[in-house]
């Protein structure tokens, strides 16, 4: 008789979960020479340690404190890139600029990119059928709280001028209950950051609006003020140009308007 | 090329008010924070804090506050450090740095002497 | 209050010879592999000039000859070598945390 499982609102862990972690692993330390020292073997181990046998509702930070510390990366504190809804064109932007970092460019946020995963209370066991969904059924759930401290420590660790990519076409550019809103904003260091420079993507070929004076802007603006923190703003009004004049910044057509 | 241009010595008495001015050129003001910092003749740097250019917000060291106030004329790229109430003690150089500390003033010298 | 305790206090080398000077935290001024702690040389009626920032990282303009170590609470400023125009003082500062603070300075000179 097949004993009585959980359901949850979300969808299951990712199939072929531990392979693709512990294969993400070998990948980014083979082609970062500086995290060659990292055991892809105690990265999964303790990976696996921050949820197995636990319930997915009662996730800690502290559950996954052996992996962050095995994950410890330096990563060069004034070329970090933020983003908020545009993850792609966030990506695709530090494919293009090296020097430049987001959150999924570090080890540990490679290792989780677009993978979902819990398991079950007192069982080794783990949970491919579902798992808690944030809003329906807790937020406190692996993958969320993953996404929340390894969030935290990449805003924490920023310095100088920080970027962050927002999403023009979405109707709250800055969502104050975002990843960015909620953590990442918070947890910039006033000492360390002496300014948040804000661009945002317009998604229409015509749209020549000043998104930059967007109410939710001013709310962006309001808060990073609050903390400190200096504040500025750029509208991309040309996605695909702005990415071209990236590659070819000598491009003469890059001397205008983006 | 970047540059902060800071007013020229001050000699003072002892109760008067002093007003030093940092003129930045070469960037936006608004766009990096200053710091102020002490030298007293033949010692060390001693930090006294910084204005947000962008919302005017300053933030004194410990040993700064109350007699010591930073403000801005975002018009004319200008920072200020006003010295109220001025004792002795205060002789010094004081210097304006952009944020960051790569690119300091030339320095103001401020003698307060009876 | 981070203190920053510099030795020595003075220092003299012969030309072309390397010079070390240290500066001890009382608390760590490292967050995440990066260390906030910058290096400053002074020449007398001159401000200060930014040598090394982040510990390590040799700011535009400065000669390689200069270099920056060390990580949490300790760290070193390297001259190597020494010519006659390093003459001046140098300074640690921290800006990990406010207060950021200065060391009490180390006057080179040549032997």
């Known amino acids: 008789v097949p004993r009585w499982r959980q359901q949850w609102s979300g969808p299951g862990t990712t199939k072929r979960f531990p392979e693709t972690v512990l294969a993400r692993c070998v990948k980014y330390t083979e082609i970062h020479p500086e995290m060659r020292h990292v055991d892809c073997q105690s990265v999964w181990d303790a990976f696996k340690g921050a949820f197995i046998s636990k319930h997915p509702c009662n996730i800690t930070e502290e559950d996954y404190q052996p992996l962050m510390k095995l994950g410890t990366q330096t990563v060069p504190c004034n070329k970090i890139l933020l983003w908020s809804r545009i993850k792609d064109l966030a990506h695709q932007f530090t494919q293009v600029q090296r020097d430049m970092f987001t959150l999924e460019d570090t080890l540990l946020g490679y290792l989780a990119d677009d993978l979902t995963w819990c398991g079950e209370f007192n069982t080794s066991k783990i949970n491919y059928q579902s798992c808690p969904d944030w809003r329906k059924d807790c937020s406190n759930n692996p993958v969320s709280v993953f996404w929340k401290t390894v969030s935290r420590r990449f805003a924490e660790a920023a310095c100088d001028v920080v970027h962050v990519m927002l999403n023009g076409s979405r109707s709250k550019i800055f969502d104050k209950n975002s990843t960015f809103g909620s953590v990442e904003v918070h947890n910039l260091q006033p000492e360390k950051v002496q300014t948040l420079e804000a661009w945002v993507i317009h998604g229409g070929r015509e749209d020549s609006r000043d998104l930059c004076q967007d109410p939710t802007i001013k709310e962006l603006e309001s808060i990073i003020s609050k903390r400190n923190i200096q504040f500025s703003c750029k509208n991309i009004y040309r996605p695909d140009k702005f990415l071209q004049c990236v590659k070819n910044p000598e491009d003469s057509s890059c001397t205008s308007e983006i | 090329q970047i540059q902060l241009v800071q007013s020229g010595p001050e000699l003072k008495k002892p109760g008067e008010t002093v007003k030093i001015s940092c003129k930045a050129s070469?960037?936006?003001?608004?766009?990096?924070?200053m710091n102020w910092v002490k030298q007293a003749p033949g010692k060390g740097l001693k930090w006294m804090g910084w204005?947000?250019?962008?919302?005017?917000?300053?933030t004194y060291a410990d040993d700064f506050k109350g007699r010591f106030a930073f403000s801005l004329e975002t018009s004319a790229s200008t920072a200020f450090l006003q010295i109220n109430n001025l004792k002795n003690e205060d002789t010094a150089t004081y210097f304006c740095?952009?944020?960051?500390?790569?690119?300091w003033g030339q320095g103001t010298l401020v003698t307060v002497s009876a | 209050n981070i203190v920053l305790t510099q030795s020595p206090a003075s220092l003299a080398v012969s030309l072309g010879q390397r010079a070390t000077i240290s500066c001890r935290a009382s608390?760590?001024?490292?967050?995440?592999?990066?260390?906030?702690m910058n290096w400053f040389q002074q020449k007398p009626g001159q401000p200060p000039k930014l040598l090394i920032y982040?510990?390590?990282n040799l700011e535009s303009g400065i000669p390689a000859r200069f270099s920056g170590s060390g990580s949490r609470t300790e760290f070193t400023l390297t001259i190597d070598p020494v010519e006659a125009d390093d003459v001046a003082t140098y300074y640690c500062?921290?800006?990990?945390?406010?207060?950021?603070?200065f060391g009490s300075g180390t006057k080179l000179e040549i032997k």
């Open positions: 740095v952009r944020r960051g500390f790569a690119y």
């Open positions: 070469g960037y936006t003001l608004t766009s990096y924070g």
């Open positions: 204005i947000n250019t962008y919302t005017g917000e300053p």
């Open positions: 608390e760590s001024v490292e967050i995440y592999g990066n260390g906030f």
């Open positions: 982040r510990a390590s």
């Open positions: 500062q921290q800006i990990n945390e406010d207060p950021f603070t």
